[in-house]
């Protein structure tokens, strides 16, 4: 239904607290460099205005679209051009072009310092002094670093943060209580960020149809007892919600997400037997719980997929009459039978099926032509299964850090032109797949591994798109989203690459490395490893092992020395000389 005042409608639906949080996220994702205090002023102004519209929907400007209202606020910021350069040009445009322009200026890799978690004592002091400001800062810090973070989900993580701080700040050892709990929230949130970025990439590059296909496959796996019509309705709603969030319509997105949760809880009988526990929770937790819900049990009496999609004499007729519906039905039927496959794999199979019908239905004897299609799926299924097997075996042998290093060597050889920080970030994230997925039961490994890798590779593509340097990466990133991971897996050493000359300063270290936290130490070592590979792309595993082992011993020795600075200064050049020799 149409509302006189969109902003009043959203304020009433969402409530003041969530409304303010979402407006803060929206502003932080659009203008990523502004300090919190500047944004919170705008949030308060927008909230006060929304309240006047709730009181009187006919009040001045209350009929304006939310994009218009938000855009006008952002464009009124003093010194916008000084701080944001050409983003200020967006302000000369009218809606909807102005919002599109803002979206195009979102920066996936903003020049912001990595967010350092404050000491437990300081967090608790500031949280207890002003919980609202503290959590506002959390929303701001995450949103500006992740401009596509799924806004209603970010509100959920802020709520989790609140719970953890409320619980831990009364403990005597605050740090012991906070650290593991906040680490767990952070890990989940970072994965959520890359997954959502992939959804927005899918929407931006390939449109709603591609995203809806993803949603059909995912929903069918989760809710195998639901009818195709029900799955289609859910997929359509999820597509609309994600389109809104990816497009910056955060209030509408959050409101629609709450509506979808309400619908699912009112229609459990036709969706899944597993929803009840989620449906007893408050709105943010309910939506999150539904998004993470375990798969329902597969119906026992499902017939073979071949009956309707290979053996039926009407296959070509059914396909010709309604291609999208027929392919959607195929995707639904195949996905509900295979919770053990990744969504990417299911979409590749559906694509293969579509290509087969396109070819065969134009031939003289279609059934003879498409009769072997299911057998032709076999290599497509085997490839990711082998990927999981070999990578999980390697992870089990090397552990997370060693596995990350193996991935880093592999990817630096595939795309040595990519900047070292980007390669290190990608390899560290790709390497975490072992910890995340390889410990799961067999049936859950493949979907976990492949869908996670796809999301991480999408991040690599997004960063590479900003400054393209590798033709191979561009090629893999330009193709279909579901073919990306196989494309990257198939890349070999880039033979066109001219090795980087050896620069001693790249491998010169100082005593400051000794006081770094373990994670930062690892990043320093991995940076050196990537640089070594760029210098010697064809170095053997043994050569790299020797040099990195030597390097680790050198750091260890000098960090234990009485005069650390002197040790680094004298032993460093020896290490460089030995490394050059080992790689000669």
């Amino acid at each position: 239904e149409a509302h006189k005042s969109e902003i009043a409608h959203r304020f009433k639906d969402l409530g003041e607290q969530h409304f303010k949080g979402l407006v803060l996220i929206a502003f932080s994702q659009y203008l990523q460099k502004c300090p919190y205090e500047e944004h919170i002023k705008l949030v308060q102004e927008v909230t006060d205005f929304a309240k006047t519209c709730v009181a009187d929907e006919n009040a001045e400007n209350c009929d304006k679209s939310i994009h218009t209202l938000f855009g006008d606020k952002l464009c009124a910021i003093p010194k916008l051009r000084d701080n944001y350069g050409e983003l200020a040009d967006c302000c000369a445009k009218q809606e909807p072009e102005r919002n599109e322009c803002f979206l195009q200026h979102k920066d996936d890799n903003p020049n912001l310092p990595p967010f350092q978690r404050p000491e437990a004592e300081a967090m608790c002091t500031s949280f207890q002094e002003n919980p609202t400001s503290f959590l506002g800062h959390y929303l701001h810090e995450v949103a500006r670093r992740h401009p596509y973070f799924y806004a209603p989900e970010l509100l959920y993580y802020a709520e989790k943060y609140n719970e953890v701080l409320t619980q831990c700040c009364t403990e005597s050892d605050k740090a012991a209580c906070l650290t593991p709990k906040l680490d767990a929230v952070k890990e989940k949130a970072l994965v959520a960020a890359v997954r959502q970025r992939m959804k927005c990439s899918s929407m931006q590059r390939f449109g709603e149809r591609a995203f809806k296909a993803w949603a059909v496959a995912r929903m069918s796996q989760r809710f195998p007892n639901a009818e195709f019509a029900e799955i289609t309705k859910l997929a359509t709603d999820v597509t609309k919600i994600n389109k809104e969030c990816c497009h910056g319509d955060l209030l509408e997105c959050a409101d629609d997400r709450a509506e979808l949760a309400k619908y699912m809880c009112e229609n459990q009988a036709t969706i899944s037997s597993k929803l009840q526990a989620c449906c007893d929770k408050p709105v943010l937790q309910k939506s999150q719980c539904l998004a993470e819900i375990e798969h329902d049990n597969i119906p026992a009496d499902l017939p073979s997929i071949a009956a309707d999609f290979v053996e039926d004499k009407e296959v070509c007729k059914n396909y010709a009459e309604a291609k999208d519906v027929f392919l959607g039905t195929f995707l639904y039927e195949y996905s509900r039978r295979h919770p053990d496959y990744s969504v990417s794999l299911l979409l590749r199979l559906a694509k293969k099926y579509e290509a087969t019908l396109e070819k065969c239905c134009a031939e003289g004897d279609p059934p003879a032509c498409y009769g072997t299609v299911l057998a032709e799926f076999q290599p497509l299924v085997e490839e990711p299964k082998n990927l999981v097997k070999t990578n999980c075996e390697l992870y089990e042998k090397l552990g997370e850090y060693g596995f990350q290093n193996a991935v880093l060597v592999r990817y630096t050889q595939k795309a040595p032109q990519v900047s070292t920080p980007t390669l290190v970030e990608a390899a560290r994230n790709l390497g975490r797949v072992g910890t995340k997925c390889c410990t799961l039961p067999e049936a859950q490994r493949l979907p976990c591994v492949e869908d996670y890798l796809s999301a991480i590779l999408n991040r690599l593509c997004v960063l590479h798109e900003k400054t393209p340097v590798s033709e191979k990466v561009t090629k893999c990133c330009s193709g279909s989203l579901v073919e990306r991971r196989p494309c990257f897996s198939a890349l070999t050493v880039d033979e066109t690459y001219v090795p980087k000359e050896f620069k001693a300063e790249t491998f010169t270290f100082h005593s400051d490395i000794c006081t770094l936290p373990d994670k930062e130490k690892q990043i320093k070592k991995q940076t050196a490893l990537a640089e070594l590979v760029k210098h010697k792309p064809k170095a053997t595993e043994d050569q790299l092992k020797t040099v990195m082992g030597d390097f680790a011993q050198f750091v260890d020795k000098c960090c234990k020395a009485a005069d650390k600075d002197n040790c680094f200064a004298t032993e460093g050049p020896n290490l460089v000389a030995r490394s050059k020799e080992a790689l000669a």
Epitope: P118, E119, A122, S126, E129, N130, S133, H137
Partner: nanobody
Framework: EVQLLESGGGLVQPGGSLRLSCAAS????????MSWVRQAPGKGLEWVST????????YYADSVKGRFTISRDNSKNTLYLQMNSLRAEDTAVYYC??????????WGQGTLVTVSS
């Protein structure tokens, strides 16, 4: 790395005013309680004032109460100390410090305030 850089010190006559600033970098400023501490020539350290992370609570040593005002601008990562009605005994090097539990884990280099006619 963490840096605290004080500025605004100088020579001022008794009864005059000065405003000290402390620019913080290398850490997330807003969640930290911040303080000013001073050291008069030949004396030990003396705590002057403390401000809570969002500025809603301030504390002062009796010797400066009513004359000094501590404030902060979290958007600029800056701590301030407005000093009015200055006296000769306020002459000291003023340090800003990042507070942690019962002590301070980082100090600035200090800025010298001299009150003399």
């Amino acid at each position: 790395e963490v840096q605290l850089l004080e500025s605004g010190g100088g020579l001022v006559q008794p009864g005059g005013s000065l405003r000290l600033s402390c620019a913080a970098s290398g850490f997330t400023f807003w969640p930290y309680t911040m303080s000013w501490v001073r050291q008069a020539p030949g004396k030990g350290l003396e705590w002057v004032s403390t401000i809570s992370p969002f500025g809603s609570t301030t504390y002062y040593a009796d010797s400066v109460k009513g004359r000094f005002t501590i404030s902060r601008d979290n958007s600029k990562n800056t701590l301030y100390l407005q000093m009015n009605s200055l006296r000769a005994e306020d002459t000291a090097v003023y340090y800003c410090a990042k507070k942690l539990s019962n002590g301070f884990d980082y100090w600035g280099q200090g800025t010298l305030v001299t009150v003399s006619s």
